[in-house]
Amino acid sequence: SQVSQNCHNGSYEISVLMMGNSAFAEPLKNLEDAVNEGLEIVRGRLQNAGLNVTVNATFMYSDGLIHNSGDCRSSTCEGLDLLRKISNAQRMGCVLIGPSCTYSTFQMYLDTELSYPMISAGSFGLSCDYKETLTRLMSPARKLMYFLVNFWKTNDLPFKTYSWSTSYVYKNGTETEDCFWYLNALEASVSYFSHELGFKVVLRQDKEFQDILMDHNRKSNVIIMCGGPEFLYKLKGDRAVAEDIVIILVDLFNDQYFEDNVTAPDYMKNVLVLTLSPGNSLLNSSFSRNLSPTKRDFALAYLNGILLFGHMLKIFLENGENITTPKFAHAFRNLTFEGYDGPVTLDDWGDVDSTMVLLYTSVDTKKYKVLLTYDTHVNKTYPVDMSPTFTWKNSKLPNDITGRGPQ
Amino acid sequence: SQVSQNCHNGSYEISVLMMGNSAFAEPLKNLEDAVNEGLEIVRGRLQNAGLNVTVNATFMYSDGLIHNSGDCRSSTCEGLDLLRKISNAQRMGCVLIGPSCTYSTFQMYLDTELSYPMISAGSFGLSCDYKETLTRLMSPARKLMYFLVNFWKTNDLPFKTYSWSTSYVYKNGTETEDCFWYLNALEASVSYFSHELGFKVVLRQDKEFQDILMDHNRKSNVIIMCGGPEFLYKLKGDRAVAEDIVIILVDLFNDQYFEDNVTAPDYMKNVLVLTLSPGNSLLNSSFSRNLSPTKRDFALAYLNGILLFGHMLKIFLENGENITTPKFAHAFRNLTFEGYDGPVTLDDWGDVDSTMVLLYTSVDTKKYKVLLTYDTHVNKTYPVDMSPTFTWKNSKLPNDITGRGPQ
């Protein structure tokens, strides 16, 4: 049922759900700092626009009475719990900075009629797609899936002359929250990825993965996995790998590949890394000093969530429109706003668009080099290195099925 | 975290979660009546055993602030919500009469360390199997699955001389809660049923089901569905059905088939109905006057939950044992107690055992007749009618694959 909102008469409140369970193991204090930094910027922007209003955040903490704290696997009801707490206290703001856990967000939409805008730094799963009042500020699984299908089909680049239609997916259940949902989406039999591929098998055991690397009877040369180089090394070690194996390592929220002094270890030579185009603005930010690269993206998403609210608030106030309406709740999509780190584009469903970057290891320099970029907004690939110094034969990506000629 | 229990010094309380979302659309007032009737019996039994103690129930109602009320699909967090309410009020009893919805029960075990015994009239799904402190008093999906595998393999009865290894499953998403989880279990690729079958396809559209009935290229003659005769008629109507089609209609909680004046409609001739051996004790009960046959089972499970608690309380008190211990929480299994309707047996995992009955329509009398019974406790089938007057050729169930001879 509807709760009155602290969201009128020049006073606008943001309800921030501070969950014990989170997509990334980030101290809540850091997220508070990110929100507060965002608030400072929003207040400045509103004042700059001649809007003399008050914008504050209320941090709603779980009491820990019921929920096992930790990762997202036991988070399903925590968001609803906090929503009930807000409802009981009649402290609903204009917007919810909601759970980052897919289970939790999905449950909030399943169990309630959410007529408030909700902004999430996470909620990666396909089950959170197409929610009319949900905005997601970290690349959701659907975006990854569309890249992979696009890349698999590509056959007109100097370094990729074969369409692919097969894949192995390595998924052992120990993944981080982002990886868990990315791989879930690839595994789902009804997903776009599965629909477009002719063959796809999920490898769940380390041994299955290790065996495939040299198996002459393998059904695909391509293996998708998710995590960092260390994760791959733990699994692959220094094992020999057949020359036409391609490992796609999804590691979106890690910009270490772009640091100057980084050398790619030898075991990365058969690997293409998919990551996001790097940002650097948080390096000197007051709240980001102790953040790892991944957590930088997480904290940045919280900060950008505040800036997005400020952007929408400014537009509605300038147009003399009411904030506590369905129109406001449904407006957080199909737009570009100024994030902390530059413009942020949201698609028609409120999901962040970004530039994904596919990296390879140069056999000459042992450095990570950009092979191509992909714009999720237009679902288009842009080749960058037309003559990559690959490990693969003829500096071309192999066919996905050994012994199959050009199609 | 643990909450102090109202469960000592001669005063023993039962916490009954009265959910807005429920497995069966049963007025909560009727469930209260069932609980109160059970309490009267328990008090009498304890007094009769010379145990002068107080036993009461506290009914914990959802406030409806957050949750969409209705069926179980939006119930996931309601149980946890009530548990939080109990925790905050420090009103935990010795035992929880818990949610009937699978999602809700599963979530309570996922998100918390439940060290209280929980008794459920429902929680049918496989995800609630093997919970160490959960007792389920209505046949869970695992029991159905074991019957089906047993029956499929059977090939030594006069009326079933073929082992089956294939099936269609009709599942269109509009099922009642019990059916939803029964069919989910059959659909699950990792379930015992799927593991034991060579071919299984889920039909999700009415048209798919209707087409199979006369499709010469069908891969199986057997179709499992869940619901009552009316549900089947709405789907099948008076369409012609190939002579070797067998429809298995799962309708466990419906004893109308056993009423004297019931005639089987013509469209049921190709159908075997799986139901539970009927009870009649509730017909004259004060709380059951307005109950439909299905709801009789639901209310009875609540009543039996109270009797089960009384049974365990009596044993522990007579042995001088503490009630607020893990031993008590884990004791509600591998036992038989006196239910309202006769002895009730719980298996090693706290799930109710029962006698399932497979009915066919006699082509002579147009009556439902018992073909066989199945004891879930020993996983054994007992033929009843050795010369059934079937619609099928030679009064034998056909092979599951047309044209395949004896195996």
């Epitope: 922007r45 626009a49 940002g279 530059g342 | -």
Partner: antibody, heavy 119, light 107 residues
Framework: QVQLQQWGAGLLKPSETLSLTCAVF????????WSWIRQPPGKGLEWIGE???????NDNPSLKSRVTISVDTSKNQFALKLSSVTAADTAVYYC?????????????WGQGTLVTVSS | EIVMTQSPATLSVSPGERATLSCRAS??????LAWYQQKPGQAPRLLIY???TRATGIPARFSGSGSGTEFTLTIGSLQSEDFAVYYC?????????FGQGTNVEIK
């Protein structure tokens, strides 16, 4: 105290490319958009375009096809190139900092560079 | 683009008097409007933003008002250092646009 110091060629022939650079001293570079604004002699101010530390730009459509604004974060510098200049491009060119990120008004200005286009 | 029109082009005022400068936008800019002062040979200086908020270090005699399309800059009591050209600028949308300026001269 933030200071903007700009330099570049002051005299150009028609069809040449104007090239100016602005260096930022004493303040954060990443938290702002950095603009170029020009003022023809005896006339008003015209906004040319802006860039942030990530290289995201917004340009004035009236000049867009000829304008390139770039950034070098390692040096805290940004630059303007205006191709195919004509006499109409004669102006004092200012670099300026927005008062805050995306604020759109300018609280710190360079000293200005007079660029004359003459054959 | 949004066209900004200032009036009058020139305003002659005696020291100590009040000066009122007008700025009109071709479409609503809400309150996304700034005023600048420019003296000969110098870069412009930000006076007002948000239509009415004084920038850091700007004396109280400068005040701004208005919203939507009509804006006013008022200089309460003109000092000798206030004689200059004043520009309004909108920043509601891109491209940022300036008025053509009002020259405040000594009467």
């Amino acid at each position: 105290q933030v200071q903007l110091q700009q330099w570049g060629a002051g005299l150009l022939k028609p069809s040449e490319t104007l090239s100016l650079t602005c260096a930022v001293f004493g303040g954060s570079f990443s938290g702002y958009y950095w603009s170029w604004i020009r003022q023809p002699p005896g006339k008003g101010l015209e906004w040319i375009g802006e860039i942030n530390h990530r290289g995201n730009t917004n340009d004035n459509p009236s000049l867009k096809s000829r304008v390139t604004i770039s950034v070098d974060t390692s040096k805290n510098q940004f630059a303007l190139k205006l191709s195919s200049v004509t006499a109409a491009d004669t102006a004092v060119y200012y670099c300026a900092r927005e008062r805050g990120y995306t604020y759109g008004n300018f609280d710190h200005w360079g000293q200005g560079t007079l660029v004359t286009v003459s054959s | 683009e949004i066209v900004m029109t200032q009036s009058p082009a020139t305003l002659s005022v005696s020291p100590g008097e009040r000066a009122t400068l007008s700025c009109r936008a071709s479409q609503s800019v809400s309150r996304n409007l700034a005023w600048y002062q420019q003296k000969p040979g110098q870069a412009p200086r930000l006076l007002i933003y948000g239509a009415s908020t004084r920038a850091t270090g700007i004396p109280a005699r400068f005040s701004g008002s208005g919203s939507g399309t009509e804006f006013t800059l008022t200089i309460g009591s003109l000092q000798s250092e206030d004689f200059a050209v004043y520009y309004c600028q909108q920043y509601k949308t891109w491209p940022r646009t300036f008025g053509q300026g009002t020259n405040v001269e000594i009467k």
